[in-house]
């Protein structure tokens, strides 16, 4: 999977608009590794 | 409202260095990497590197080979860079970008820094 | 680096119509390409994220298609404020790269 900053906050966004934003406030892109997807 | 405001435009000698600073507004800094480009006359756009404003990481084009130096004030939410040993070849508009998610998702964009090099 | 190929470099194109521009990518990217417009003496303005994924504010006359190496930005009717330069970019590897830029003007 790609790991650049760029594909992360994406992947991020469409995570959280999965899951309706309810997710912690601090799962953020610049704090979560690739292992967290 | 987001807004990535840099500094003003420079002139410089070749040989010097120079620091360019992108002011973030608007949203939270540290939350997400800021990207540096530059566009030559001219020239296609060329990405400089990024930054984690969290952990101060950094990722660079090897393009630039160590002339190029990314930092943060996360107090100020300010990203800065800084290039050194100037050449002629350096005359661009730099920006800063950054891809936010929240509070709205899109790719922002600091209104750019003109840098010339000339003796 | 990874080498994105945009075309053509230039164009002229009437309103209404409909205007493709095309960029190739020396190895695959998968769909992680982003399309901008960037207007004379401007910052660039984002259009399309993962290949085909429009920005919220941008104008569904604009999309984007592809995956791989062949990537494709449409303007479905062209309008008078769409005279700019479009530029792909990958992000699927660092270095990012950007594409040469395509320069749009209205016949």
């Known amino acids: 999977a790609c790991d650049t900053a760029t594909c992360v906050t994406h992947r991020l966004a469409g995570l959280l608009s999965r899951s309706g934003g309810v997710v912690k406030n601090n799962f953020v892109p610049t704090n979560v590794g690739s292992k967290a997807f | 409202e987001v807004q990535l405001v840099q500094s003003g435009a420079e002139v410089k000698k070749p040989g010097a260095s120079v620091k360019v600073s992108c002011k973030a507004s608007?949203?939270?800094?540290?939350?997400?990497?800021m990207n540096w480009v530059r566009q030559a006359p001219g020239q296609r756009l060329e990405w400089m590197g990024v930054?984690?404003?969290?952990?101060?990481?950094?990722t660079y084009n090897r393009k630039f080979k160590g002339r190029v130096t990314i930092t943060v004030d996360k107090s100020a939410s300010t990203a800065y860079m800084e290039l050194s040993s100037l050449r002629s070849e350096d005359t661009a508009v730099y920006y800063c970008?950054?891809?936010?998610?929240?509070?709205?998702?899109?790719?922002?964009w600091g209104q750019g820094t003109t840098v010339t090099v000339s003796s | 680096d990874i080498q994105m190929t945009q075309s053509p470099s230039s164009l002229s194109a009437s309103v209404g119509d409909r205007v493709t521009i095309t960029c190739k990518a020396s190895?695959?990217?998968?769909?992680?390409v982003a399309w901008y417009q960037q207007k004379p003496g401007k910052s660039p303005k984002a259009l399309i994220y993962?290949?085909?994924y429009r920005y919220s504010g941008v104008p569904s006359r604009f999309s984007g298609s592809g995956s791989g190496t062949d990537f494709t930005l449409t303007i479905s009717s062209l309008q008078p404020e769409d005279v700019a330069t479009y530029h792909c970019?990958?992000?699927?590897?660092?270095?990012?790269?950007f594409g040469q830029g395509t320069k749009l003007e209205i016949k």
């Open positions: 970008a950054s891809l936010l998610i929240r509070p709205h998702y899109f790719d922002y």
């Open positions: 608007g949203y939270t800094f540290t939350d997400y990497y």
């Open positions: 930054i984690n404003p969290y952990n101060v990481r950094t």
């Open positions: 190895q695959n990217v998968g769909t992680n």
């Open positions: 993962s290949a085909s």
């Open positions: 970019q990958q992000y699927n590897f660092y270095p990012y790269t």
